[in-house]
């Protein structure tokens, strides 16, 4: 017997859609082999209609697709706009139609229920609004207008023009009678419930001259859209609920095992702690649509999500919703990287940010997630060189190591830097990742002087002391600028005396500026790296002043562990608002990005072996 399994019988009505799920053993071969949906002909041959390799037959063009979910051992065939001609015998299978693994499926498409002549069909999603149109003749213009609901053989009054409203429809129904000359009245029902489903009768007048019109109201629960994203990646739920609820509080919730829906985030400021640092609710557009971005996807994020609108910011019956079923693929294309990066006060972190390697030319960004209200993520640095002023001299985004990873270095750490950061690009939005920076106890590994004042025209020597644990690393000095850190020649001056209990491998590497010019003023970093992978850095600010006395200046190693003086920056710190992120230049596909907090992880020269998910930067 075939190990492929699915529904033996599928039945639906004309105009509807079906979503046929076929299950297969998720072996490595099965996961990657061709999947197909074919129709069995009289000859016994099975003609492919749609396959996982992108083929769609002309009969299915624009109305069918096949999606493989290798993680779950499932593929789904969606067919829309069904007609009676679609009735027949099909196979879903793997491999080749004639000799692969397959399963027989019978599809029956019927005409749908018989309705009274002239019945108008209204198909509306739950929570939305329907307007039922009821025509009448001139002689019934002054007479009572009413809408009834047919339940079995009886008719129950729903609303009439004498101000009666059935309690089940209280506060969500109105009957509108137009001015003279218009021979039609309308009944508007808001916030449709599933229980509103059924056959209705409009009536104007009474007795044998009355006008009647049947209306079949079909209230549909939204079918969840299947969303399949990679572990550690990002998902965006776009929620368009309509203008009627544009000014009502919005929410995203996740259905739990009790079939209730736990709020994940809403516009009233509520947020599930499990999503701290990795979620943003984008401000809504004028049409009331909004989106929610979740980064750092985990397996436990899988489930059914609903977005909706209600003044309480949570799910209530009769209000519009949209639904998604999120699957998280553990066979992720997004590489593992630390979710927590540790640094010490005064020290540094180097954060590795993954991006889609096919998009090496994309612009890269790093932003700080802020949890207030719906969350936002002001950009701190971008690959074109923008750096927020308060981060001058201590933040840099480097294209290295390349091939799917860029690096962000942040030094002169303070406790204020603890928090969540996002890495993102203006390309594939699914590659947004998040990292938490934690500030821990400890001393920086690299020792440099505090503030340095150089004299124009003279020689300046700045020492940087590296402990022995960095003996195998490449040491460098660079001059920081908005666009990166330009490497400078430096010289190894042999063992350092700044580290006791250490062997000859501790080094003193100096930067010499000779002669000092006005252009030399600015921030300098000394650091370590291994190939294209950066480790710790330390920063020094060099001020340049006019010559006062003759002679060269040398910053003595004895001052090397003095705390650097704090550089006072212009207090008018430039803040990149969400609208900057919405700039299409930044995010070709998604204006939401500005609000999407981007968190990034930091890679330190020393790795905390206590957890594969954490990198440490403390001195050991």
């Amino acid at each position: 017997k075939s190990p492929v399994f699915g529904p033996q019988e599928v039945s639906s009505v004309e105009g509807n859609s079906v979503s046929i799920k076929c299950y297969y053993p998720p072996t490595s071969v099965n996961r990657h082999t061709r999947k197909y949906w074919c129709r069995k002909g009289a000859s016994g041959r099975c003609i492919t209609l749609v396959s996982s390799e992108g083929y769609v037959s002309s009969n299915y063009a624009g109305r069918a697709n096949l999606t493989n979910f290798p993680e779950n051992g499932t593929f789904v065939v969606n067919i829309a706009q069904l007609s009676r001609d679609d009735s027949g015998h099909y196979k879903c299978g793997l491999g080749i139609n004639s000799r692969g693994l397959s399963f027989d499926v019978s599809l029956e498409v019927s005409q749908g229920p018989e309705l009274p002549n002239g019945t108008e069909v209204y198909t509306v999603d739950v929570g939305r609004t329907v307007t039922i149109k009821c025509p009448f003749k001139t002689e019934n213009a002054p007479k009572t207008k009413a809408l009834y609901k047919k339940i079995g053989q009886t008719s129950v009054l729903v609303i009439d023009s004498r101000n009666y409203v059935n309690p089940n429809y209280k506060d969500r129904i109105r009957l509108r009678i137009p001015g003279t000359g218009q021979l039609i009245f309308t009944v508007v029902i808001d916030r449709l419930r599933l229980s509103d489903h059924g056959l209705y009768l409009c009536q104007a007048g009474d007795g044998s001259n009355r006008d009647e019109k049947n209306a079949d109201l079909q209230v549909l629960e939204p079918e969840p859209e299947l969303v399949y994203e990679d572990l550690r990646g990002s998902v965006t739920f776009h929620c368009a609920l309509g203008l009627e609820v544009a000014n009502v509080a919005k929410f995203l919730c996740r259905v739990n095992s009790r079939e209730t829906c736990d709020v994940v985030i809403n516009t009233l400021g509520k947020r599930d702690s499990a999503f701290e640092g990795r979620i943003l609710l984008n401000p809504q557009d004028k049409d009331g649509s909004f989106s929610v971005v979740i980064t750092g996807l985990r397996k436990e994020d899988e489930g059914r999500y609903l977005c909706g609108a209600h003044s309480d910011g949570q799910l209530q019956e009769g209000w519009p919703i949209q639904a998604w079923q999120l699957f998280v693929n553990e066979e992720s294309t997004i590489p593992r990287s630390p979710t927590v990066v540790k640094g010490v006060a005064g020290g540094s972190v180097a954060v590795l940010c993954p991006y889609n390697p096919k998009e090496s030319q994309s612009l890269k960004y790093w932003c700080l997630w802020e949890g207030a209200q719906n969350g936002r993520c002001p950009l701190l640095v971008e690959s074109q060189g923008l750096v927020q002023e308060q981060y001058e001299g201590r933040l840099s985004l480097l294209q290295e190591p390349g091939n799917g990873t860029f690096t962000v270095i942040l030094n002169q750490l303070t406790t204020q830097d603890a928090g969540f950061y996002w890495c993102l690009t203006n390309g594939d939005t699914r590659w947004r990742t998040t990292v938490e920076i934690k500030i821990i106890e400890g001393e920086p590994n690299l020792k440099v002087p505090g503030n340095v004042t150089a004299v124009l025209g003279e020689t300046l020597n700045i020492p940087c002391h590296f402990p022995c644990k960095f003996s195998s690393y490449e040491k460098y000095w660079c001059k920081w600028s908005n666009t990166g850190c330009q490497t400078l020649p430096s010289q190894d001056e042999g063992p350092s005396e700044a580290f006791v209990n250490c062997d000859e491998n501790s080094r003193l590497v100096s930067l010499t500026l000779n002669p000092v010019t006005r252009a030399d003023e600015g921030w300098y970093w000394c650091g370590v790296k291994q190939g294209h992978f950066y480790g710790e850095t330390a920063a020094v600010y060099v001020a340049v002043e006019e010559k006062k006395v003759a002679g060269s200046r040398y910053v003595s190693p004895a001052k090397a562990d003095a705390a650097p003086d704090e550089k006072v920056l212009d207090s008018g710190v430039r803040e990149i608002e969400n609208k900057a992120i919405q700039d299409p230049r930044l995010f070709a596909e998604e204006k939401v990005v500005a609000d999407t907090g981007d968190q990034a992880g930091g890679s330190r020269a020393s790795v905390d072996s206590s957890s594969s998910e954490e990198q440490g930067g403390s001195s050991k």
């Epitope: 529904p7 599928v10 639906s12 629960e221 095992s257 699957f327």
Partner: nanobody, 129 residues
């Protein structure tokens, strides 16, 4: 919460028929998967059949190989009861039959017990001459 109550079990001769019913009460949904499982003495519980439906009137019916062509699953118009019509019964069909329901539709394999949130107490079917 949803309560499920099975009925229709009993003693029947080989080749005979029975119709099992599963009535759902409490909170009901417009989109469901309901399944039948069975457990023979000393055996593990196994999948028999399932039916999924959506609010637009689309149905999906699933059967295990051993009952295909003999059993038929259906749902009545009241939308709260699912039936399993069992024809050409065999002694090996003897088991306690359980009804199970999931209100969120089945995204995993409908043959898997873990897909179902709600379970009935079971009804005994004995096929013997």
């Amino acid at each position: 919460e949803v309560q499920l109550v099975e009925s229709g079990g009993g003693l029947v001769q080989p080749g005979g028929s029975l119709r099992l019913s599963c009535a759902a009460s409490g909170r009901t949904f417009s989109s469901y998967t309901m399944g039948w499982f069975r457990q023979a003495p000393g055996e593990e519980r196994e999948f028999v059949s399932a039916i999924s439906w959506s609010s637009d009137g689309t149905y999906y019916k699933y059967y295990t190989d051993t009952v295909k062509g003999r059993f038929t699953i259906s749902r009545d118009n009241a939308e709260t009861t699912v039936h399993l019509q069992m024809n050409s019964l065999k002694p090996e069909d003897t088991a306690v039959y359980y009804c199970a329901a999931s209100s969120s539709g089945t995204y995993g394999d409908p043959r898997s017990e873990r897909e179902y949130r709600y379970w009935g107490q079971g009804t005994l079917v004995t096929v013997s001459s």
